[in-house]
Interface confidence: medium
């Protein structure tokens, strides 16, 4: 039945999320005649591209085509052939490419150029590859989860579609954690958004939303770890770094050149009298937490209140969906349950980090050691970021919902991105007749698409 036109009148869209650590391809599907309704688009496939993020191909751009092949071929199989030509394909690159662009605009452009040439070889309607801003990443994540939760629908339902759904029209805040950046996005309660850079105005389905968003570049879990290592190696007594964020007995040699490769460690860079150092885990949650807190500068705030590094953050309001690495890490640690208090999470993290590395390897034999070794750091980082960075408390912790999927669709920025670029979120409540393009929401950034 593959590649045969389906009797129903459906449409498809493809979005590639080119993240810092990997690329994922998402295929979305919706009934053609209902495309202006809220909650009708759903994800039918996720294909994780084998290999690192696209920014790592800077010295081997000729390999990008092969890298994308498997998942693009998968899309060819899933989407009926008759619809290939009208299926839009978008690629959005996030913080990994933002960092590469900071290092060299020319190198970032070269990577995107090869990506575009590779994707335009497929029979789909390729709409361009671009580096999305941190603000867009936050906004589209917020749109995605609220779209999937039915928050934009004017019809109040008597049932919940997800266990943590509050049956009202209050939107959820969005907490997104990637490898290189993290985003916080929510509607503050009657609070002026004191810094214009963090303010978004939307009109969706006839309702106005004043949304706060910020993307912290270099504060994704992978870059935060690089930052922490660069900070701590400055004061190590030799080329041995006794690190509380890794399990006791864990050892790993790190190249100083790798440590200083990322712009995120520039502020800690110094000439070290060695080219490599060895991490030796000592597995102490409290010390790890303390070390992480040193990455957050809370001494400077030019606003009524800040998150860290002088960035405005209004008082937290309502429920939050925490997704991407917030979810993956907490899911691995078995801490996503609504019933787990913040105190309990901290307790569990203390025990987990203190477990010897040999024991951990045995308990999780199927997990790649590189990932396995970093869960102590990542879990501690998530707690530090949410509690000290964003000022959640033991009480407001109850309002954080660790979400992987909603109604079968991954929580993340890709769905919101596609909904916006395909004009599927109307500014006004849909009438029985289709609306003209002029009434659709336009995010206040201009989108430059390369049509091939």
């Amino acid at each position: 039945t593959q590649n045969k036109a389906l009797p129903e009148n459906v449409k498809y869209g493809i979005v590639l999320d080119a993240g810092s650590s990997h690329t994922s391809l998402y295929i979305y599907k919706w009934p053609a005649e209902k495309e202006n309704d809220t909650g009708v688009v759903h994800q039918v496939e996720e294909c994780r591209v084998k290999g690192p993020g696209i920014s790592k191909f800077v010295q081997k751009v000729n390999e990008i085509g092969i890298y994308l092949t498997d998942c693009m071929e998968r899309a060819r199989e899933v989407i009926p052939r008759s619809q290939h030509q009208e299926t839009p394909v978008y690629l959005g690159a996030t913080a990994g490419m933002r960092l590469l662009r900071m290092e060299s605009e020319e190198l970032a452009d070269r990577v995107l150029d090869v990506v575009e040439r590779s994707l335009s070889n497929y029979p789909f309607d390729f709409q361009g590859a671009r580096i999305i801003t941190g603000q867009e990443e936050g906004a589209y994540g917020w749109i995605t989860i609220n779209y999937l939760l039915g928050k934009f629908s004017q019809k109040t339902r008597w049932f919940s579609i997800v266990p943590y759904e509050t049956n009202n029209q209050e939107t959820f805040g969005a907490l997104d954690l990637g490898g290189a950046s993290t985003q916080v996005t929510f509607v503050p309660q009657n609070q002026t958004i004191e810094s214009p850079d963090n303010a978004l105005q939307f009109r969706l389905y006839g309702k106005d939303y004043n949304v706060y968003t910020h993307s912290f570049l270099c504060y994704g879990k992978d870059q935060a770890l690089w930052q922490k290592l660069a900070k701590d190696i400055q004061v190590a007594s030799n080329e041995i770094l006794r690190d509380p964020c890794f399990h006791p007995g864990y050892k790993k040699v790190v190249n100083v050149s790798d440590l200083y490769k990322t712009p995120c460690t520039k502020r800690f860079e110094m000439t070290l009298p060695f080219q490599q150092f060895e991490i030796q885990g000592i597995g102490n949650y409290q010390q790890c937490h303390q070390s992480i807190l040193e990455l957050f500068n809370t001494s400077y705030c030019p606003y009524s209140q800040c998150a860290f590094n002088g960035i405005f953050l209004p008082p937290l309001q309502g429920d939050f969906g925490a997704f991407s690495a917030f979810y993956f890490v907490m899911k691995f640690l078995n801490l996503t349950s609504e019933k787990v208090s913040q105190e309990k999470v901290t307790e569990m993290m203390k025990k987990f980090c203190a477990q010897p590395w040999e024991e951990i390897k045995t308990s999780y034999a199927g997990v790649k050691e590189k990932y396995l070794s970093e869960y102590c750091f990542s879990g501690t980082y998530i707690l530090s970021l949410l509690l000290q960075g964003y000022h959640f408390t033991a009480d407001s912790w109850e309002h954080i919902h660790f979400i992987g999927k909603i109604q079968g669709s991954d929580a993340g920025w890709t769905l919101g991105y596609m909904l916006n670029l395909t004009n599927m979120i109307p500014a006004e409540q849909p009438l029985s007749t289709p609306l003209s393009h002029s009434t659709y929401v336009a995010h206040h950034h201009h989108h430059h698409h390369h049509h091939h």
Epitope: S237, N238, E239, I240, K251, V253, M270, T271, P273, F274, Q275, Q276, F277, E278, Q280
Partner: antibody, heavy 119, light 107 residues
């Protein structure tokens, strides 16, 4: 007090092997990285090799890479230099020295042991 | 590799003289530099570390300074026991490299 005593030097034919030892005392050997440095007759000092405190990191001078191997036994407080495929130009006094940055980089040296490579 | 160019290669001086020895680094060494003293039949002795910090127990007539990529060892008033060979050593990167040495002889 800190003491480093090298041994194992001698006369050896080109192409043959020799193992030098450096016995450490007066400090916590397992905390320190260790170096071998040599000095050819009438010449200056030349760095040879380094090993970190836990043996995880090793560096070699290009002139000895692939022929010399640095190792240590922390339980015996001893540093070693295994020298294979010896050449005439390896003739030198070999010194060991300890290393712990910032304050203790090559701060204590042994008296040296003489290696002569000659047919 | 970082080249350490030491000058002069030898000098003759009298007791009480002020003596200056210079090392120039071919690349940035960020102050990661030792000054060593070698006397025949004795273990090599470190005098100065981190470019200007005096090793404990070393007489205060020895001092180290830095000006850009030039590093200087100064002996303010030469004593009889100071006649020896002096080396600079950079430890900013591997391979560690030494200056060629300066032999200080009695005039």
């Amino acid at each position: 007090q800190v003491q480093l005593v090298e041994s194992g030097g001698g006369v050896v034919q080109p192409g043959r092997s020799l193992r030098l030892s450096c016995a450490a005392s007066g400090f916590t050997f397992s905390d320190y990285g260790m170096h071998w440095v040599r000095q050819a007759p009438g010449k200056g000092l030349e760095w040879v090799a380094y090993i970190s405190s836990g043996s995880s990191i090793m560096y070699y001078a290009d002139t000895v890479k692939g022929r010399f191997t640095i190792s240590r036994d922390n339980s015996k407080n001893t540093l070693y230099l295994q020298m294979n495929s010896l050449r005439a130009e390896d003739t030198a006094v070999y010194y060991c020295a300890r290393d712990l940055y910032y304050d203790h980089v090559l701060d204590y040296w042994g008296q040296g042991t003489t290696v002569t490579v000659s047919s | 590799d970082i080249q350490m160019t030491q000058s002069p290669s030898s000098l003759s001086a009298s007791v009480g003289d002020r003596v200056t020895i210079t090392c120039r680094a071919s690349q940035e060494v960020s102050g990661y530099l030792n000054w060593l003293q070698q006397k025949p039949g004795k273990a090599i002795k470190r005098l100065i570390y981190a470019a200007s910090t005096l090793e404990s127990g070393v007489p205060s007539r020895f001092s180290g300074s830095r000006s850009g990529s030039d590093y200087t060892l100064t002996i303010s008033s030469l004593q009889p026991e100071d006649f020896a060979t002096y080396y600079c050593l950079q430890y900013a990167s591997y391979p560690r490299t030494f200056g060629q040495g300066t032999k200080v002889e009695i005039k």
